[in-house]
Interface confidence: medium
């Protein structure tokens, strides 16, 4: 069964996925795809890494964590209802049928409040920024309110802090973190 994560329209969704590299810098290719993990590879690939770096992404999808340490959690910017669905994080461990596959369910809800029109200034959109974390039981949503000057990397930092303090153990307990080597 998939682990469920939630976000609101116009906000940023965070889908956690981790592995522990056998040695620092000894990276394993990872792909993220829209749809449940197939037998091989990822279907509808939205982002891919190789042994060195991100080598393919599609609009709005990026890794904001330290993927060189195995944090391959996916950030989806400015989500819409169409982003709802299952996402596959596939850690492509060398060897036959060694891949680790995680299916994560993203549920997008309509925005609760229509924000007052903001004066157009530039395209660092003044969306309410949000973190989605999984605690015990149903997914919890933490909204940071309308913070036009907070952007993805700051959100990522906050996400890392949340993950360190509350989320990591839950994820590891549920098998969403793997150790390689």
């Amino acid at each position: 069964s998939e682990v469920e994560y939630r976000a609101e329209v116009g906000q940023n969704a965070y889908l956690p996925c981790f592995y522990t590299p056998a040695a620092p810098g000894n990276l394993v290719p990872v792909c993220w795809g829209k749809g449940a993990c197939p037998v091989f590879e990822c279907g509808n690939v939205v982002l891919r890494t190789d042994e060195r770096d991100v080598n393919y992404w599609t609009s709005r999808y990026w890794l904001n964590g330290d993927f060189r340490k195995g944090d391959v959690s996916l950030t989806i910017e400015n989500v819409t209802l169409a982003d709802s669905g299952i996402y596959c994080c596939r850690i492509q461990i060398p060897g036959i049928m060694n891949d680790e596959k995680f299916n994560l369910k993203l549920v997008i809800k309509p925005a609760k409040v229509t924000p007052a029109p903001t004066r157009q200034r530039d395209f660092t959109a003044a969306f309410p920024r949000m973190l989605t974390t999984r605690g015990h039981g149903p997914a919890e949503t933490q909204t940071l309110g309308s913070l036009p000057d907070i952007n993805l990397t700051q959100i990522s930092t906050l996400a890392n802090e949340l993950r360190d303090s509350r989320l990591a153990n839950d994820l590891r307990d549920s098998g969403a973190t793997i150790r390689i080597g």
Partner: antibody
Framework: QVQLVQSGAEVKKPGASVKVSCKAS????????MHWVRQAPGQGLEWMGI????????SYAQKFQGRVTMTRDTSTSTVYMELSSLRSEDTAVYYC?????????????WGQGTLVTVSS | DIQMTQSPSFMSASVGDRVTITCRAS??????LAWYQQKPGKAPKLLIY???TLQSGVPSRFSGSGSGTDFTLTINSLQPEDFATYYC?????????FGPGTTLEIK
């Protein structure tokens, strides 16, 4: 105000390497992605790669894989682009350009450009 | 990679004219299209993003439209400072790619 200030012009011989710097000011350095785009004389714009100054993750255009390295120094709010095994066709103006997210590679501020001339 | 084409490559116009530049993507890119203006010896300047959204500080005589594969940049009532080269750029998927440019010259 936001500024991206690049290092000065360089003249290099074929086979050499060049390292161009881009110092950011006027905003939180780790809060925006940085890209490198080049423009050969009289030609169009060519994207080379992206670096996330926060985590250091990068992605390079296939054409430059193995020859380009993008790094950053958060203590000085500076990103670097190193291009190796230079050839004459690498003669171009190299720009750093900021983008606020991967929504996506939209470049709202640019450096002034660094002319790299490769000549024997 | 997604290929971007622009037409025309060159065009001449007079101050006060209304001009249209077209950009075509080799595949559907939704509204992930931006337009830049570049003057000789200068860095490009963002004019429009998301196909039709005007960047802050850009005069309202610039407008963009289109989605999918076909896009247009329109400049109403050309001003002397508008004579430059214009590039479209897709940001739908990596790598970001630019059109070859349209140079707008004074007639």
């Amino acid at each position: 105000q936001v500024q991206l200030v690049q290092s000065g012009a360089e003249v290099k011989k074929p086979g050499a390497s060049v390292k161009v710097s881009c110092k950011a000011s006027g905003y939180t350095f780790t809060s925006y992605y940085m890209h490198w785009v080049r423009q050969a004389p009289g030609q169009g714009l060519e994207w080379m790669g992206i670096i996330n100054p926060s985590g250091g993750s990068t992605s390079y255009a296939q054409k430059f894989q193995g020859r380009v390295t993008m790094t950053r120094d958060t203590s000085t709010s500076t990103v670097y682009m190193e291009l190796s095994s230079l050839r004459s066709e690498d003669t171009a103006v190299y720009y750093c350009a900021r983008s606020p997210g991967v929504v996506t590679a939209l470049f709202d501020y640019w450096g002034q450009g660094t002319l790299v001339t490769v000549s024997s | 990679d997604i290929q971007m084409t622009q037409s025309p490559s060159f065009m001449s116009a007079s101050v006060g004219d209304r001009v249209t530049i077209t950009c075509r993507a080799s595949q559907d890119i939704g509204s992930y299209l931006a337009w830049y203006q570049q003057k000789p010896g200068k860095a490009p300047k963002l004019l429009i993003y998301a196909a039709s959204t005007l960047q802050s500080g850009v005069p309202s005589r610039f407008s963009g439209s289109g989605s999918g594969t076909d896009f247009t940049l329109t400049i109403n009532s050309l001003q002397p400072e508008d004579f430059a080269t214009y590039y479209c750029q897709q940001s739908y998927s990596s790598p970001p790619t630019f059109g070859p440019g349209t140079t707008l010259e004074i007639k």
